[in-house]
């Protein structure tokens, strides 16, 4: 069978905490060089389920700044520009990985943390529960 | 500005690569314990800009499995359940941090990488360019 050759240039892993503790190079490699810089930048205003972006800052976290979406309305904007409460604006959430300084205030020691962020909003048909 | 006191229990940072290379504990701490497990799980079907989720797996990346949203239609679903091409379904994208094995196949050495993922779709009013 295939043997995935372990790279001989790998750092030493004889750490007593291995494999829980790993070395991470914080020099970020950005794979998004060919993406449209506009991206979804104006969708928050043009959407039928518009949202506001709130800045969340935490110096003990990496990245320290995260933007959170909050839907502007309970309903969705209809063709007349009014809020239609027969539809619902809901946040689209995603779990993302961040680095949390651990122990606190340490410049070079982190722990992976999973947090839930709202990225934007979408308009959905509500689930109607009929009472018998 | 604020001066964060350095914790005396911090690991040694006399690494020649410091502060680019840090230690990270991969034991994930999940902050989402009180979140609704349903979350946006069915929004992809109920949205007026529905989407499909595609699996992307990569053992050289952490997390190794990422789900990408692809909008089902160019237009949005109207009240009659038909696609209305006067509106546009667009992906809501977010830059997220992942860990990339570096050098490749190394079990305990990573580099931070920024990738752009589509989390879901929203319905927007199109930008109409009028020709003079």
């Amino acid at each position: 069978g295939i043997t995935i050759p372990r790279n001989p240039g790998c750092p030493n892993s004889e750490d007593k905490n291995f494999p829980r503790t790993v070395m991470v190079n914080l020099n970020i490699h950005n794979r998004n060089t060919n993406t449209n810089p506009k991206r979804s930048s104006d969708y928050y205003n043009r959407s039928t389920s518009p949202w506001n972006l709130h800045r969340n800052e935490d110096p003990e976290r990496y990245p320290s700044v995260i933007w959170e979406a909050k839907c502007r309305h309970l309903g969705c904007i209809n063709a007349d520009g009014n809020v239609d409460y027969h539809m619902n604006s809901v946040p689209i959430q995603q779990e993302i990985l961040v680095l949390r300084r651990e122990p606190p205030h340490c410049p070079n020691s982190f722990r992976l943390e999973k947090i839930l962020v709202s990225v934007g909003c979408t308009c959905v048909t509500p689930i109607v529960h009929h009472v018998a | 500005g604020i001066t964060i006191p350095r914790n005396p229990g911090c690991p040694n940072s006399e690494d020649k690569n410091f502060p680019r290379t840090v230690m990270v504990n991969l034991n994930i701490h999940n902050r989402n314990t009180n979140t609704n497990p349903k979350r946006s799980s069915d929004y992809y079907n109920r949205s007026t800009s529905p989407w499909n989720l595609h699996r992307n797996e990569d053992p050289e990346r952490y997390p190794s499995v990422i789900w990408e949203a692809k909008c089902r239609h160019l237009g949005c679903i109207n009240a009659d359940g038909n696609v209305d091409y006067h509106m546009n379904s667009v992906p809501i994208q977010q830059e997220i941090l992942v860990l990339r094995r570096e050098p490749p196949h190394c079990p305990n050495s990573f580099r931070l990488e920024k990738i752009l993922v589509s989390v879901g779709c929203t319905c927007v009013t199109p930008i109409v360019h009028h020709v003079a």
């Epitope: - | 797996e57 053992p59 190794s64």
Partner: antibody, heavy 124, light 110 residues
């Protein structure tokens, strides 16, 4: 030695059923996703189905969807392919193959171990 | 018809370099790493290259792979008689939700 051994092939009439087995040895079977791939006489390789390491997820080629079922018994280190409503175009050598990366992967690092194949002939 | 397109045949004399292309789309090669398989007549396929350009142990370094955009290629340098075989590219396809193989290329050593 890592090995996959298919069995259960044979000659069958159109519309009938057949069950293929693939016995695995030499690796921790329950850690790997598994595939079935077929090759019609004189033709190229055609992917049939994949099953996740724990059997919770399965995907099929459109040509076999609704007729074939992939399954596994990790306690017996065995992969199965249940083939119903067989057609002449299902005639092929059927190979089972193992995913290269261990864990929740369907295709990562390729299909690194293949069986020798078992022949299925659908003919009246 | 395969969603991954390969030339039906390629040939070269011993010692030469032969290249095989594999063309796909954004739903397959555009998003997933490509694998290459070698199949000699009468035998089961063998993994030759994985993750776009990595060789499993035991595969000679005469074989190299690359991937860019929606296409991939396999190069065989210093062609030898034992390289005479069928070669298939393969990857995952998001639209079909499955693993897909290329149409195959028969390499002949003249």
């Amino acid at each position: 030695e890592v090995q996959l051994l298919e069995s259960g092939g044979g000659v069958v009439q159109p519309g009938r059923s057949l069950r293929l087995s693939c016995a695995a040895s030499g690796f921790i079977f329950s850690n790997y996703g598994m595939h079935w791939v077929r090759q019609a006489p004189g033709k190229g390789l055609e992917w049939v189905a994949v099953i996740s390491y724990d059997g919770s997820n399965k995907y099929y080629a459109d040509s076999v969807k609704g007729r074939f079922t992939i399954s596994r018994d990790n306690s017996k280190n065995t992969l199965y392919l249940e083939m119903n409503s067989l057609r002449p175009e299902d005639t092929a050598v059927y190979y089972c193959a193992k995913v290269g990366a261990s864990g929740d992967y369907y295709y990562s690092y390729g299909l690194d171990v293949w069986g020798q194949g078992t022949t299925v002939t659908v003919s009246s | 018809q395969s969603v991954l397109t390969q030339p039906p045949s390629a040939s070269g004399t011993p010692g030469q370099t032969v290249s095989i292309s594999c063309s796909g789309s954004h739903s397959n090669i555009g998003r997933h790493p490509v694998d290459w398989y070698q199949q000699v007549p009468g035998a089961a396929p063998k993994l030759l290259m994985y993750y776009g350009g990595y060789r499993p142990s035991g595969v000679p370094d005469r074989f190299s792979g690359s991937q860019s955009g929606t296409s991939a290629s396999l190069a065989i340098s210093g062609l030898q008689s034992e390289d005479e075989a069928d070669y298939y590219c393969a990857t995952w396809d998001d639209r079909l939700v499955g693993y897909v193989f290329g149409s195959g290329t028969k390499v002949t050593v003249l």
